[in-house]
Amino acid sequence: GPETLCGAELVDALQFVCGDRGFYFNKPTGYGSSSRRAPQTGIVDECCFRSCDLRRLEMYCAPLKPAKSA
């Protein structure tokens, strides 16, 4: 079931979920991709003080970068 994630555990979980995309705790975009990356309460409030699932954690991943054409 869902569990709380804090400190280094939270960072490890984000690295696992986001992979090469990376992640950030900062400003969401105004609209479009990543504009709803994070719930209003913030990742610590959402995942450390309470439990959160992987889908919610993924909202903090950086957007996928389109593949560069040759």
Epitope: K27, P28, G32, R36, M59, P63
Partner: antibody, heavy 117, light 111 residues
């Protein structure tokens, strides 16, 4: 609890400007985009634009570029919208609304602007 | 600009009826982050709008389960399984995958 408290109704002259406010409380004001929405009497909702209070970044819908100017003061958790060169077309109720993961989940009560000579 | 076309614009119902509102977008609202940026709002007479459904099909906290959202890409639907008096008002779809826009609104009213 989250609240967005807007300033009171305005009666203004054509050609003038008006600045309305939206005071936020109960959440981290700087970390969420604040949106502004227009509703003319008996009409639908029009998205005007949005501001990120953390750094002042803005996005505007085309029709409102040059008409609306969005600003925010993080120290007082207040967002502002100034409307310039007012005409009768600007007579409307204006709403502020924060947007986050759940969409625009909290709205102000609306500010009525009446443009009349 | 993305245009959202709502149908019908007026929807007369009896209490207890099922109601269905369509919202069609001129562009796909599926974003590269895997989310589809389509929400539904209700504005009751004399009140500020309130969110009902976010990201196509998720009911906002406190919204009764008689409300449901569905769809993908460019075609979306809001359904009310059994209309109650408190549901009367104007329903708007809203997209924020591109520069945000609202649909024109659907007025749910009594026959």
């Amino acid at each position: 609890q989250v609240q967005l408290q807007q300033s009171g109704a305005e009666l203004v002259r054509p050609g003038s400007s008006v600045k309305i406010s939206c005071k936020a409380s109960g959440y981290a004001f700087s970390n969420l985009w604040m949106n502004w929405v227009k509703q003319r009497p008996g009409q639908g909702l029009e998205w005007i634009g949005q501001i990120y209070p953390g750094d002042g970044d803005t996005n505007y819908y085309g029709d409102f570029k040059g008409k609306a100017t969005l600003t925010a003061d993080s120290s007082s958790s207040t967002a502002y919208m100034q409307l310039s060169r007012l005409t009768s077309e600007d007579s409307a109720v204006y709403f502020c609304a924060r947007i986050g993961y759940y969409g625009m989940d909290y709205w102000g009560q609306g500010t009525s602007v009446t443009v009349s000579s | 600009d993305v245009v959202l076309t709502q149908t019908p614009l007026s929807l007369p119902v009896n209490i207890g009826d099922e109601a269905s509102i369509s919202c069609k977008s001129t562009k796909s609202l599926l974003s590269s982050d895997g989310l589809t940026y389509l929400d539904w709002y209700l504005q009751k007479p004399g009140q500020s709008p309130q969110v009902l459904i976010y990201l196509v099909s998720n009911r906002f906290s406190g919204v009764p389960d008689r409300f449901s959202g569905s769809g993908s890409g460019t075609d979306f639907t809001l359904k009310i399984s059994r209309v109650e008096a408190e549901d009367l008002g104007v329903y708007y779809c809203f997209q924020s995958n591109y520069l945000p826009t609202f649909g024109a609104g659907t007025k749910l009213e009594l026959k």
